[in-house]
């Protein structure tokens, strides 16, 4: 219902007589003054009941210095309480009074929800000057009010340091429902009930909601705003929306994109970066992550040769970064390598299967029967030593590596020797005589130097001394060598 | 508990018109709308329409438009189904039904047989 | 105007079998719900929204199925299970019920 704007009884009249700009008397209302063109008078509501008393804030009354004449107490006149009115309209509305002339230097502000308005507003304060009295009429106009001009307006004038103010004048600006909340794109588990949150104001109030999935409208019977939709679960991708609708009409939110968390898809371009002996270094582009984190992967490894029994060994790694190191392998031997990450819903399928070689090891054991003795004649010593029996992986033998330590009082040197893959004997200059040599010898291949056979050593005499007895390590075991002098 | 009432077994005779009631209770009324179902002797279960509780509007399906009028007193929480112009094809089981989101008929009151018979 | 066939029309099983009825439709719908009704009695909600037990109902029956294809289980049929069953769907107005599967005892 619209009330009429009404004017109260007042304790002082508007004008005294007649105003220039066809403003008229006391018992007019305000929604007849003049306003700037292209207004367009809004619905109006009186702030307080007709026929009550004026109770606002009001300048007590004084005795004036020329006589015993007692002023009137000063007053903002009654304006419209309640204005109502679309988004992207003008509004013009205003607050007057009348102050006797004995008062100087008067100025009223506007203030809007308990704050001064300053600076780029359009407030006009216009003054009509009589005998005794000057009107004066403040004027605020807002163009294409927006939502946020919203709220409680009200004059206020400072008089001799008293303070009057204006009842207050509510603009109230009506549109479309606007969303304070619309519902978020989620990853949900399939067959799972999940929340949808909608959320708009007006005004106009109420706010009805209708939700809508892919393009069919949930509920039939909208509900009040904020409404919660409780989806029962989902089978596949789906798009909501919520239409919000008021008085005024509707306004339609985001589409949300509803995904269903899946298994990944599995990874792709499985890379060898680097491959060793004993490990190989892969890397991986991950798959799709089925809307789900990943969680980690699984490196799976097989080697590729008909005689092994086929078994596949599984090294889990974290899903990133997208790089392991798998270790533990076997010297030049084949593998085909595999990779799947996991996701709180499981499991990707393999990847595409690579194949990967590591490359000749080390040599694992050591030449066998090393024997030592010394020729005075040459002054050399002479090693022998038989090729030991190495693993195919450990690939083609290249050489050998002799290590020779010469210890005297307080002396000590080690010296290194290589020979070639033919060669089962050396001989190495007698160093330092009155000394003992201790020898060690290593298969060498492509993949490295092999393990050190066990020490043998053997004493080197004095020039004069004669020794042809060998030393020698026992063929099969590690059993201390006996030394012969 | 949620209940849905229906007003009794109705006999009535081509070209009157007879009026079902359906009652409910334990609930908002005006929260969810209210579906009118018909199930003819040995047949299966047709859609007729609902009503918007908060409303007043109805809303027919194709079959149910011209002499079918669905109406509400939210005061007594009652929805109602208006048949006017009755024919024999129209004798059948009516039944109220609580309509949820999703088209789901979670509530169906007991049923209203009309028959059509000169 | 979306049709939903369900198969079998008749359906005769034994107390303790598992038995599974179909609803077809004739485009792809959001969701499927079903409903029970016992002779001379109203309609009972079973399954909503395609997977989702009704209040009350025993954990012997579910439901599953997307797109055009739905399924209504019953794990293992009780004597109070021998009823018609209806499906209902949602996503393109107006909601339309399948025909009926009747399942009577063997």
């Known amino acids: 219902a619209i009330t009429e704007a009404r004017e109260e009884a007042k304790p002082y009249p508007l004008f005294p007589g007649p105003l220039p700009g066809s403003l008229q008397t006391d018992h007019t209302s305000l929604l007849s003054l003049p306003h700037t063109s292209g207004y367009q008078p809004a619905l109006m509501f009186s702030p307080t009941q007709p026929g009550r008393p004026y109770t606002g804030n009001v300048a007590i009354p004084r005795v004036t210095s020329a006589g015993s004449k007692l002023l009137p107490p000063l007053a903002f006149k009654h304006t419209v309480g309640h204005i109502i009115l679309s988004e992207h309209k003008d509004v013009k509305f205003n607050c007057s009074i009348s102050v006797p002339n004995i008062y100087q230097d008067t100025t009223i502000s506007w203030w809007k929800d308990g704050k001064e308005l300053l600076g780029a507003h359009h407030a006009i304060t216009q003054f009509y000057p009589d005998d005794e009295v000057t009107a004066i009429i403040a004027s605020f106009s807002i163009t294409s009010v927006q939502r946020s001009d919203n709220g409680s307006y009200i004059c206020k004038m400072k008089i001799n340091n008293e303070e009057i103010v204006s009842d207050p004048i509510y603009i109230e600006v009506q549109g479309l429902p606007h969303f304070t909340k619309q519902p978020e794109s989620m990853n949900v588990t399939r067959n799972t009930a999940f929340n949808l949150t909608c959320q708009a104001v007006g005004p106009p109030e109420p706010v009805n909601i209708f939700w809508v999935q892919n393009s069919s409208r949930v509920n039939e019977q909208p509900e009040k705003s904020p409404s919660v939709l409780t989806v029962p679960g989902l089978t596949e991708m789906a798009v909501f929306s919520c239409e919000a609708h008021n008085d005024k009409g509707l306004t339609v939110s985001k589409g949300v994109q509803i995904n269903i968390k899946a298994i990944p898809s599995p990874p792709t371009e499985v890379s060898i970066h680097n491959s060793t002996a004993h490990s190989i270094l892969i890397s991986w582009v991950p798959g799709f992550d089925g809307y789900s984190p990943f969680r980690n992967c699984s490196v799976q490894v097989k080697e590729v040769d008909p005689l092994s029994n086929g078994s596949v060994m599984i090294f889990n790694t974290s899903a990133s970064p997208h790089m392991y190191q798998i270790k533990q392998l076997q010297a030049l031997a084949n593998y085909s390598i595999g990779v799947s990450c996991m996701n709180e819903i499981g499991w990707s399928a393999v990847s595409p299967w690579i194949l990967a070689s590591t490359t000749e090891g080390a040599p694992s054991v050591a030449p066998l029967n090393v024997t030592v003795f010394l020729n005075e004649s040459r002054d050399n010593v002479d090693i022998r030593w038989m090729k030991p029996l190495t693993k195919r992986q450990a690939g083609e033998l290249v050489g050998y590596r002799i290590s020779h330590v010469w210890q005297s009082a307080g002396i000590s040197k080690e010296l290194l020797e290589e020979v070639g893959q033919n060669n089962s004997r050396a001989q190495i200059s007698v160093q330092v005589h009155n000394a003992t040599c201790t020898v060690r010898i290593a298969a060498v291949t492509k993949g490295g130097v092999g393990p050190f056979s066990d020490p043998v050593k053997i004493f080197i005499p004095a020039h004069g001394w004669v020794d042809h007895a060998p030393s020698s390590t026992p063929a099969p075991g590690n059993a201390d060598p006996v030394l012969i002098i | 508990q949620v209940q849905l009432v229906q007003s009794g077994s109705e006999l009535k005779k081509p070209g009157a018109s007879v009026k079902v009631s359906c009652k409910a209770s334990?609930?908002?009324?005006?929260?969810?709308?209210m579906s009118w179902v018909r199930q003819a002797p040995g047949q299966g279960l047709e859609w007729m329409g609902w009503?918007?509780?908060?409303?007043?509007?109805?809303t027919y399906t194709d079959d149910f438009k011209g002499r079918f009028v669905f109406s509400l007193d939210t005061s007594v929480s009652t929805a109602y189904l208006q048949i006017s112009s009755l024919k024999a094809e129209d004798t059948a089981v009516y039944y109220c039904?609580?309509?949820?989101?999703?088209?789901?008929?979670?509530?169906w009151g007991q049923g209203t047989l009309v028959t059509v018979s000169s | 105007d979306i049709q939903l066939t369900q198969s079998p029309s008749f359906l005769s099983a034994s107390v303790g079998d598992r038995v599974t009825i179909t609803c077809r439709a004739s485009s792809s719908v959001g969701y499927m719900h079903w409903y029970q009704q016992e002779p001379g009695k109203a309609p009972k909600l079973l399954i909503y929204?395609?997977?989702n037990l009704a209040q009350g109902v025993p954990s012997r029956f579910s439901g599953s199925g997307s797109g055009t294809e739905f399924t209504l289980t019953i794990s293992s049929l009780q004597p109070e299970d021998f009823a018609t069953y209806y499906c209902q769907q949602w996503g393109s107005l107006p909601f339309t019920f399948g025909q009926g599967t009747k399942l009577e005892i063997k």
């Open positions: 009503i918007n509780t908060a409303s007043g509007v109805p």
């Open positions: 039904a609580r309509y949820t989101n999703y088209g789901v008929f979670d509530y």
């Open positions: 929204a395609t997977s």
């Open positions: 334990s609930y908002t009324f005006t929260t969810y709308g």
